[in-house]
Interface confidence: medium
């Protein structure tokens, strides 16, 4: 069950999933003067048997340097129109996939890929927060917020996190 | 249950660095949040900063910036603590220690790294 | 930046005595206190989390009170290896600061 909304936003903060269940969506997104292949994958999915998870297709850009540059939108898939955005960092090397059965690693990233990350997450995804540099926690945790499902809708909980310039 | 396990003891000279290493077992080691704590002899408890290893950026503890570097390397579970410009008073018993979060306290500790700083 | 103050900063007692130490903080850190037991030589060891909540595995005549800016620590009963040194600690806010410590010793 895809989450309705995007996680909390807490000024000043970024949010970041550690490892993403089954089920979890990421746009193909490329950057500024690229475009999606002919024919490619509108977005990776995290999906697995109990023992193991992995993103399912690809994503691949090309240079649009013939159309026009303006930015791409990528079509959204039908069951979810929310943007829920990371920011692009460096591929860290992930938990043990042991620890975290029917959940997928943060994906590599691919070539001329957007900064910005737009997944759609699913019910029981967790995500944690942390005050941007210059910025500082008050009320230190909990720093997490959770896709919950209750009464039919789905909803996230609120983390406990100020952050004071 | 995870253990931290921290590097061995130092001894170093005035004006040098030490780096001191904490590898996490037994449990997922991003989530959480990893501190950094020292203990001169017969003193209490100081808080140097911190670092969550899915975000990989660092908190200092005003008195220590700029002569602290804290990281971490999810690859091997690890977190590193490095104190430049070493002097006399220094010398402490270092520790990391995980918080979940910041709000459940620091439940896992490692089992210390003594640094002395003696010419 | 949260200022914490221990008191006493030192205790004689004997086993079987209920002791307690108390923990101001300079400002309101709601119920953001943990506790922990230090013993020579050791690394500390988490006794109370939250102002109240007992860490798994500790025994239960640790007990911890408070909200705001005061806070109590109490061992109903004294056990032999209960003498130690303890420390209070806010998670309220960067940066987290322990209270002086608190050194337990047997009369």
């Known amino acids: 069950e895809l989450c309705d909304d995007d996680p909390p936003e807490i000024p000043h903060a970024t949010f970041k999933a550690m490892a993403y269940k089954e089920g979890t969506m990421l746009n193909c997104e490329c950057k500024r003067g690229f475009r999606r292949i002919k024919s490619g994958s509108l977005y990776m999915l995290c999906t697995g048997s109990s023992s193991h998870s992995s993103w399912d297709n690809q994503c691949q850009c090309t240079s649009s340097a013939t159309r026009s540059t303006t930015k791409q939108v990528t079509p959204q898939p039908e069951e979810q129109k929310e943007r829920k955005t990371t920011e692009m960092q460096s591929p860290m090397q992930p938990v043990d996939q042991a620890s975290l059965p029917g959940h997928c690693r943060e994906p590599p990233p691919w070539e001329n890929e957007a900064t910005e990350r737009i997944y759609h997450f699913v019910v029981g995804q967790m995500v944690y927060y942390q005050c941007v540099q210059g910025y500082r926690a008050l009320h230190r945790g909990p720093a997490e917020s959770v896709c919950k499902m209750t009464h039919g809708k789905t909803r996230w909980t609120q983390p406990q996190l100020i952050c004071t310039g | 249950q995870m253990q931290l396990v921290q590097s061995g003891a130092e001894v170093k000279k005035p004006g040098s660095s030490v780096k001191v290493s904490c590898k996490a077992s037994?449990?997922?080691?991003?989530?959480?949040?990893i501190s950094w704590v020292r203990q001169a002899p017969g003193q209490g408890l100081e808080w140097m900063g911190g670092?969550?290893?899915?975000?990989?950026?660092?908190n200092y503890a005003q008195k220590f910036q700029g002569r602290v570097t804290i990281t971490a390397d999810e690859s091997t579970s690890t977190a590193y603590m490095e104190l430049s410009s070493l002097r006399s008073e220094d010398t402490a018993v270092y520790y990391c220690?995980?918080?979940?979060?910041?709000?459940?306290?620091?439940?896992?500790w490692g089992q210390g790294t003594t640094v002395t700083v003696s010419s | 930046d949260i200022q914490m103050t221990q008191s006493p900063s030192s205790l004689s007692a004997s086993v079987g005595d209920r002791v307690t130490i108390t923990c101001r903080a300079s400002?309101?850190?709601?119920?953001?206190l943990n506790w922990y037991q230090q013993k020579p030589g050791k690394a500390p060891k988490l006794l109370i989390y939250?102002?109240?909540s007992l860490q798994s595995g500790v025994p239960s005549r640790f007990s911890g009170s408070g909200s705001g800016t005061d806070f109590t620590l109490t061992i109903s009963s004294l056990q032999p290896e209960d003498f130690a040194t303890y420390y209070c600690?806010?998670?309220?806010?960067?940066?987290?600061?322990f209270g002086q410590g608190t050194k337990l010793e047997i009369k």
């Open positions: 400002q309101s850190i709601s119920s953001y």
């Open positions: 037994g449990g997922t080691f991003s989530s959480y949040a």
């Open positions: 600690q806010q998670s309220y806010s960067t940066p987290p600061a």
């Open positions: 220690a995980r918080e979940m979060y910041y709000y459940y306290g620091m439940d896992v």
């Open positions: 670092i969550i290893p899915i975000f990989g950026t660092a």
């Open positions: 939250a102002a109240s």
